[in-house]
Protein backbone atom coordinates (compact mmCIF):
# COMPACT_ATOMS: atom_id res chain seq x y z
CA UNK A 1 0.00 0.00 0.00
CA UNK A 2 1.10 3.15 -1.14
CA UNK A 3 2.56 5.12 2.32
CA UNK A 4 2.00 9.32 3.12
CA UNK A 5 5.49 9.80 1.63
CA UNK A 6 5.12 8.31 -1.79
CA UNK A 7 2.08 9.41 -2.24
CA UNK A 8 3.36 13.33 -1.33
CA UNK A 9 6.01 12.21 -3.69
CA UNK A 10 3.86 11.32 -6.33
CA UNK A 11 1.71 14.43 -6.21
CA UNK A 12 5.17 16.76 -6.20
CA UNK A 13 6.04 15.00 -9.22
CA UNK A 14 2.32 15.38 -10.86
CA UNK A 15 2.63 19.21 -9.86
CA UNK A 16 6.03 19.64 -11.39
CA UNK A 17 4.56 17.54 -14.98
CA UNK A 18 1.80 20.19 -14.86
CA UNK A 19 3.97 23.27 -14.70
CA UNK A 20 6.21 21.75 -17.46
CA UNK A 21 3.06 20.95 -19.24
CA UNK A 22 1.35 24.17 -18.99
CA UNK A 23 4.39 26.15 -19.71
CA UNK A 24 4.94 24.94 -23.03
CA UNK A 25 1.15 24.95 -23.42
CA UNK A 26 1.62 29.08 -22.49
CA UNK A 27 4.34 29.32 -24.80
CA UNK A 28 2.42 28.11 -27.94
CA UNK A 29 -1.01 30.06 -27.16
CA UNK A 30 1.38 33.21 -26.80
CA UNK A 31 -0.22 35.96 -29.45
CA UNK A 32 3.75 36.76 -30.17
CA UNK A 33 4.14 32.95 -31.84
CA UNK A 34 4.88 33.32 -35.07
CA UNK A 35 5.36 29.68 -35.65
CA UNK A 36 1.67 28.45 -34.09
CA UNK A 37 -0.04 27.76 -37.69
CA UNK A 38 3.14 25.77 -38.83
CA UNK A 39 2.99 23.61 -35.06
CA UNK A 40 -0.48 23.17 -35.32
CA UNK A 41 -0.50 20.91 -38.21
CA UNK A 42 1.84 18.35 -36.44
CA UNK A 43 0.07 15.31 -35.35
CA UNK A 44 0.32 13.85 -31.51
CA UNK A 45 -1.87 10.87 -30.79
CA UNK A 46 -4.18 10.55 -28.11
CA UNK A 47 -4.42 8.22 -25.40
CA UNK A 48 -7.95 5.69 -25.77
CA UNK A 49 -7.81 5.50 -21.93
CA UNK A 50 -5.67 7.56 -19.37
CA UNK A 51 -7.00 7.11 -15.65
CA UNK A 52 -3.90 5.62 -14.21
CA UNK A 53 -0.42 6.65 -13.93
CA UNK A 54 0.60 3.56 -16.12
CA UNK A 55 -0.88 5.24 -18.64
CA UNK A 56 1.86 8.07 -19.03
CA UNK A 57 3.91 5.44 -20.82
CA UNK A 58 1.66 7.01 -23.91
CA UNK A 59 2.85 10.39 -23.13
CA UNK A 60 6.45 9.02 -22.92
CA UNK A 61 6.10 7.65 -26.45
CA UNK A 62 5.01 10.98 -27.55
CA UNK A 63 8.24 13.03 -26.66
CA UNK A 64 10.12 12.57 -29.34
CA UNK A 65 7.24 14.71 -31.71
CA UNK A 66 6.83 16.86 -28.92
CA UNK A 67 10.35 17.76 -28.93
CA UNK A 68 10.77 18.24 -32.70
CA UNK A 69 7.98 20.50 -32.59
CA UNK A 70 9.47 23.02 -29.54
CA UNK A 71 12.68 22.54 -31.56
CA UNK A 72 10.66 24.10 -34.60
CA UNK A 73 8.50 26.60 -32.27
CA UNK A 74 12.03 28.64 -31.11
CA UNK A 75 12.22 32.22 -31.93
CA UNK A 76 12.78 35.42 -30.54
CA UNK A 77 9.27 35.89 -29.09
CA UNK A 78 8.84 32.09 -28.03
CA UNK A 79 11.67 30.67 -25.84
CA UNK A 80 11.55 27.76 -23.54
CA UNK A 81 14.29 27.37 -21.83
CA UNK A 82 16.55 24.30 -23.76
CA UNK A 83 14.05 22.40 -25.34
CA UNK A 84 16.26 19.03 -24.55
CA UNK A 85 16.68 19.14 -21.17
CA UNK A 86 12.72 20.19 -21.13
CA UNK A 87 11.71 17.04 -22.31
CA UNK A 88 14.44 14.91 -20.27
CA UNK A 89 13.17 16.27 -17.25
CA UNK A 90 9.40 15.42 -18.18
CA UNK A 91 10.69 12.05 -19.61
CA UNK A 92 12.96 11.35 -16.10
CA UNK A 93 9.29 11.90 -14.18
CA UNK A 94 7.30 10.69 -16.72
CA UNK A 95 9.23 7.40 -15.89
CA UNK A 96 9.54 7.86 -12.12
CA UNK A 97 5.14 7.92 -12.25
CA UNK A 98 4.34 5.27 -14.29
CA UNK A 99 6.91 2.48 -12.58
CA UNK A 100 8.78 0.24 -14.88
CA UNK A 101 7.06 -3.03 -13.29
CA UNK A 102 4.07 -3.88 -15.82
CA UNK A 103 5.03 -2.84 -19.73
CA UNK A 104 1.86 -1.41 -21.07
CA UNK A 105 1.66 -1.39 -24.73
CA UNK A 106 -0.17 2.19 -25.11
CA UNK A 107 -3.43 2.24 -26.89
CA UNK A 108 -4.46 4.99 -29.24
CA UNK A 109 -7.13 6.55 -30.50
CA UNK A 110 -7.84 6.61 -34.27
CA UNK A 111 -8.16 10.29 -34.40
CA UNK A 112 -5.09 12.42 -33.80
CA UNK A 113 -4.42 16.11 -32.51
CA UNK A 114 -3.16 18.90 -32.08
CA UNK A 115 0.15 20.44 -30.00
CA UNK A 116 -2.84 22.11 -28.03
CA UNK A 117 -4.97 19.32 -27.74
CA UNK A 118 -2.36 16.77 -26.65
CA UNK A 119 -1.24 19.34 -24.16
CA UNK A 120 -4.63 19.86 -22.80
CA UNK A 121 -4.78 15.91 -22.12
CA UNK A 122 -1.99 15.65 -20.27
CA UNK A 123 -2.67 18.91 -18.12
CA UNK A 124 -5.66 17.53 -17.56
CA UNK A 125 -4.94 14.09 -16.56
CA UNK A 126 -2.46 15.44 -14.09
CA UNK A 127 -4.95 17.36 -12.38
CA UNK A 128 -7.27 14.15 -12.10
CA UNK A 129 -4.74 12.34 -10.67
CA UNK A 130 -3.46 14.95 -7.94
CA UNK A 131 -7.12 15.08 -7.08
CA UNK A 132 -7.71 11.97 -6.25
CA UNK A 133 -4.36 12.27 -4.41
CA UNK A 134 -5.31 14.89 -2.10
CA UNK B 1 15.82 0.34 -46.73
CA UNK B 2 12.64 3.07 -46.82
CA UNK B 3 11.41 2.65 -49.47
CA UNK B 4 7.77 3.30 -51.25
CA UNK B 5 6.91 0.66 -54.42
CA UNK B 6 3.79 1.99 -56.94
CA UNK B 7 1.76 -0.52 -59.28
CA UNK B 8 2.18 -0.47 -62.53
CA UNK B 9 1.85 1.02 -65.43
CA UNK B 10 -2.17 1.40 -66.38
CA UNK B 11 -4.14 1.99 -69.78
CA UNK B 12 -7.58 2.93 -69.84
CA UNK B 13 -10.05 4.31 -71.52
CA UNK B 14 -11.64 8.25 -71.06
CA UNK B 15 -14.22 7.74 -68.64
CA UNK B 16 -13.35 4.61 -66.73
CA UNK B 17 -12.14 4.61 -62.96
CA UNK B 18 -9.21 3.81 -62.03
CA UNK B 19 -7.16 3.42 -58.70
CA UNK B 20 -3.06 3.36 -58.35
CA UNK B 21 -1.10 2.24 -55.03
CA UNK B 22 2.06 3.30 -53.53
CA UNK B 23 3.48 0.60 -51.05
CA UNK B 24 5.53 1.70 -48.17
CA UNK B 25 7.93 -0.28 -46.37
CA UNK B 26 11.46 0.36 -44.09
CA UNK B 27 9.84 2.71 -41.73
CA UNK B 28 6.70 3.28 -39.70
CA UNK B 29 4.36 4.39 -42.38
CA UNK B 30 1.45 5.87 -40.87
CA UNK B 31 3.91 8.27 -38.98
CA UNK B 32 4.97 10.05 -42.11
CA UNK B 33 2.44 12.18 -44.98
CA UNK B 34 2.41 10.52 -48.03
CA UNK B 35 2.39 13.34 -50.89
CA UNK B 36 1.47 12.61 -54.90
CA UNK B 37 3.06 14.36 -57.74
CA UNK B 38 1.78 14.69 -61.65
CA UNK B 39 3.89 14.75 -64.04
CA UNK B 40 2.51 15.38 -67.96
CA UNK B 41 4.84 14.25 -70.80
CA UNK B 42 7.43 16.24 -71.18
CA UNK B 43 6.34 18.31 -68.53
CA UNK B 44 7.41 19.64 -65.11
CA UNK B 45 6.10 17.94 -61.71
CA UNK B 46 2.29 19.17 -59.90
CA UNK B 47 2.37 18.36 -56.75
CA UNK B 48 -1.52 17.13 -56.50
CA UNK B 49 -1.94 16.70 -52.39
CA UNK B 50 -1.32 14.58 -49.29
CA UNK B 51 -2.51 12.17 -46.98
CA UNK B 52 -1.25 11.14 -43.31
CA UNK B 53 -2.07 7.42 -43.24
CA UNK B 54 -2.75 7.34 -39.42
CA UNK B 55 -6.14 9.21 -39.66
CA UNK B 56 -6.44 9.43 -43.22
CA UNK B 57 -6.22 13.31 -43.11
CA UNK B 58 -5.80 15.03 -46.31
CA UNK B 59 -4.91 17.96 -48.23
CA UNK B 60 -5.62 18.49 -51.92
CA UNK B 61 -4.21 21.03 -54.27
CA UNK B 62 -6.89 23.46 -55.87
CA UNK B 63 -6.30 22.18 -59.55
CA UNK B 64 -6.86 18.84 -57.90
CA UNK B 65 -9.74 19.09 -55.65
CA UNK B 66 -12.68 16.94 -56.80
CA UNK B 67 -10.48 15.33 -59.73
CA UNK B 68 -8.78 13.29 -57.54
CA UNK B 69 -9.14 10.92 -53.79
CA UNK B 70 -6.47 10.15 -52.11
CA UNK B 71 -7.03 7.59 -49.45
CA UNK B 72 -4.81 5.02 -47.16
CA UNK B 73 -4.81 1.42 -45.51
CA UNK B 74 -2.62 1.36 -43.07
CA UNK B 75 -3.25 -2.39 -42.18
CA UNK B 76 -1.14 -2.70 -45.15
CA UNK B 77 1.20 0.16 -45.40
CA UNK B 78 -0.40 1.34 -48.93
CA UNK B 79 -1.51 4.50 -50.28
CA UNK B 80 -4.05 5.24 -53.53
CA UNK B 81 -4.81 7.65 -55.69
CA UNK B 82 -7.93 7.18 -57.67
CA UNK B 83 -10.11 8.56 -60.36
CA UNK B 84 -13.73 7.96 -61.06
CA UNK B 85 -13.79 9.26 -64.45
CA UNK B 86 -10.51 9.18 -66.21
CA UNK B 87 -9.65 11.89 -69.08
CA UNK B 88 -7.60 11.97 -72.17
CA UNK B 89 -5.50 14.86 -69.96
CA UNK B 90 -4.80 12.42 -67.20
CA UNK B 91 -1.83 11.14 -69.36
CA UNK B 92 1.16 11.45 -67.04
CA UNK B 93 3.40 9.71 -65.18
CA UNK B 94 2.07 9.80 -61.33
CA UNK B 95 4.69 9.66 -57.95
CA UNK B 96 4.21 8.97 -54.56
CA UNK B 97 6.51 10.61 -51.92
CA UNK B 98 6.93 10.57 -48.32
CA UNK B 99 6.88 14.39 -46.54
CA UNK B 100 10.62 13.74 -44.96
CA UNK B 101 9.71 14.94 -41.34
CA UNK B 102 6.73 13.14 -40.45
CA UNK B 103 3.56 13.69 -38.53
CA UNK B 104 3.64 17.32 -40.34
CA UNK B 105 3.29 17.70 -44.01
CA UNK B 106 5.84 21.03 -43.78
CA UNK B 107 8.59 19.38 -44.56
CA UNK B 108 10.35 18.23 -48.08
CA UNK B 109 9.58 14.93 -49.82
CA UNK B 110 12.14 12.76 -49.21
CA UNK B 111 11.70 9.35 -50.46
CA UNK B 112 9.88 8.70 -53.66
CA UNK B 113 8.37 6.04 -55.58
CA UNK B 114 9.34 4.89 -59.12
CA UNK B 115 6.09 6.41 -60.57
CA UNK B 116 3.27 4.62 -62.19
CA UNK B 117 2.27 5.95 -65.80
CA UNK B 118 -1.72 6.31 -66.78
CA UNK B 119 -2.60 6.06 -70.53
CA UNK B 120 -5.63 7.14 -71.07
CA UNK B 121 -6.85 6.94 -75.01
CA UNK B 122 -9.76 5.76 -76.70
CA UNK C 1 -0.90 29.74 -54.59
CA UNK C 2 2.71 30.85 -54.17
CA UNK C 3 4.63 31.00 -57.54
CA UNK C 4 7.68 29.48 -58.14
CA UNK C 5 10.32 30.72 -60.81
CA UNK C 6 13.48 29.27 -62.40
CA UNK C 7 16.20 30.67 -64.61
CA UNK C 8 17.70 29.80 -66.61
CA UNK C 9 15.07 27.06 -68.16
CA UNK C 10 18.08 25.42 -70.11
CA UNK C 11 21.72 25.27 -70.01
CA UNK C 12 24.69 23.96 -71.38
CA UNK C 13 27.80 23.86 -69.35
CA UNK C 14 31.57 21.86 -69.76
CA UNK C 15 32.65 19.27 -67.18
CA UNK C 16 34.20 21.04 -64.21
CA UNK C 17 32.39 24.34 -65.02
CA UNK C 18 30.11 25.89 -61.86
CA UNK C 19 26.64 25.90 -62.68
CA UNK C 20 24.43 27.97 -60.97
CA UNK C 21 20.64 28.03 -61.05
CA UNK C 22 18.41 30.76 -59.02
CA UNK C 23 14.67 30.19 -57.70
CA UNK C 24 12.27 33.32 -57.18
CA UNK C 25 9.26 32.71 -54.86
CA UNK C 26 6.15 35.01 -55.36
CA UNK C 27 6.26 35.84 -51.66
CA UNK C 28 8.42 35.00 -48.55
CA UNK C 29 8.88 31.39 -47.74
CA UNK C 30 11.27 31.85 -45.24
CA UNK C 31 13.69 28.96 -46.13
CA UNK C 32 11.48 26.17 -46.51
CA UNK C 33 12.68 25.35 -50.34
CA UNK C 34 13.99 21.69 -51.49
CA UNK C 35 16.32 21.09 -54.81
CA UNK C 36 14.99 17.83 -56.42
CA UNK C 37 17.29 16.31 -59.53
CA UNK C 38 15.63 14.10 -62.14
CA UNK C 39 17.33 12.05 -64.60
CA UNK C 40 15.57 11.16 -67.52
CA UNK C 41 12.90 8.05 -66.53
CA UNK C 42 13.36 8.21 -62.96
CA UNK C 43 12.07 9.57 -60.33
CA UNK C 44 13.07 12.64 -58.35
CA UNK C 45 15.74 12.93 -56.07
CA UNK C 46 15.61 14.96 -52.91
CA UNK C 47 19.03 16.86 -52.83
CA UNK C 48 19.04 20.21 -50.50
CA UNK C 49 16.10 20.64 -48.25
CA UNK C 50 15.88 23.78 -45.73
CA UNK C 51 17.24 25.42 -49.25
CA UNK C 52 20.75 24.99 -47.78
CA UNK C 53 21.16 21.72 -46.24
CA UNK C 54 22.59 19.36 -48.28
CA UNK C 55 20.17 15.15 -48.06
CA UNK C 56 22.32 12.38 -46.63
CA UNK C 57 24.28 10.62 -49.49
CA UNK C 58 24.50 13.78 -51.61
CA UNK C 59 27.94 14.66 -53.04
CA UNK C 60 29.39 18.02 -51.73
CA UNK C 61 29.57 19.82 -54.59
CA UNK C 62 25.97 20.54 -54.71
CA UNK C 63 25.08 23.17 -52.58
CA UNK C 64 22.34 25.48 -52.10
CA UNK C 65 21.86 29.14 -50.57
CA UNK C 66 19.34 32.13 -49.89
CA UNK C 67 16.08 33.28 -48.17
CA UNK C 68 12.72 34.88 -48.19
CA UNK C 69 12.56 34.98 -51.81
CA UNK C 70 15.78 34.04 -53.73
CA UNK C 71 17.46 31.29 -53.93
CA UNK C 72 20.10 30.02 -55.65
CA UNK C 73 21.15 26.33 -56.30
CA UNK C 74 24.77 25.46 -57.14
CA UNK C 75 27.18 22.43 -58.51
CA UNK C 76 30.85 23.83 -57.74
CA UNK C 77 32.27 21.15 -60.56
CA UNK C 78 29.41 19.90 -63.23
CA UNK C 79 30.25 15.95 -63.24
CA UNK C 80 28.76 13.80 -66.33
CA UNK C 81 25.91 12.04 -64.24
CA UNK C 82 24.62 15.54 -62.93
CA UNK C 83 22.92 16.03 -66.87
CA UNK C 84 19.17 16.31 -65.51
CA UNK C 85 16.51 18.42 -65.24
CA UNK C 86 16.59 20.58 -61.61
CA UNK C 87 13.55 21.94 -59.88
CA UNK C 88 12.73 24.13 -56.70
CA UNK C 89 9.92 23.71 -54.19
CA UNK C 90 8.12 25.64 -51.76
CA UNK C 91 6.63 24.46 -48.38
CA UNK C 92 5.79 27.25 -46.92
CA UNK C 93 1.89 27.27 -47.73
CA UNK C 94 -0.33 25.15 -49.18
CA UNK C 95 0.09 23.72 -52.01
CA UNK C 96 3.48 22.58 -52.33
CA UNK C 97 4.29 24.09 -56.00
CA UNK C 98 7.33 23.42 -57.82
CA UNK C 99 9.31 25.77 -60.18
CA UNK C 100 9.32 24.90 -64.28
CA UNK C 101 13.02 23.01 -63.69
CA UNK C 102 15.93 23.76 -64.99
CA UNK C 103 17.36 21.20 -67.80
CA UNK C 104 21.21 20.83 -67.37
CA UNK C 105 23.56 19.17 -70.33
CA UNK C 106 27.09 18.63 -71.17
CA UNK C 107 28.89 20.70 -73.66
Known amino acids: APTSSSTKKTQLQLEHLLLDLQMILNGINNYKNPKLTRMLTFKFYMPKKATELRHLQCLEEELKPLEEVLNLAQSKSFHLRDTKDLISNINVIVLELKGSETTLMCEYADETATIVEFLNRWITFCQSIISTLT | EVQLVQSGAEVKKPGESLKISCKGS????????IGWVRQMPGKGLEWMGI????????RYSPSFQGQVTLSADKSISTAYLRWSSLKASDTAMYYCARHRGGRSYYYGMDVWGQGTTVTVSS | DIQMTQSPSSLSASVGDRVTITCQASQDISNYLNWYQQKPGKAPKLLIY???NLETGVPSRFSGSGSETDFTFTISSLQPEDIATYYC?????????FGPGTKVDIK
Open chain 2, 26 to 33: GYSFTDYW
Open chain 3, 89 to 97: QQYENLPFT
Open chain 3, 50 to 52: DAS
Open chain 2, 51 to 58: IYPYDSDT
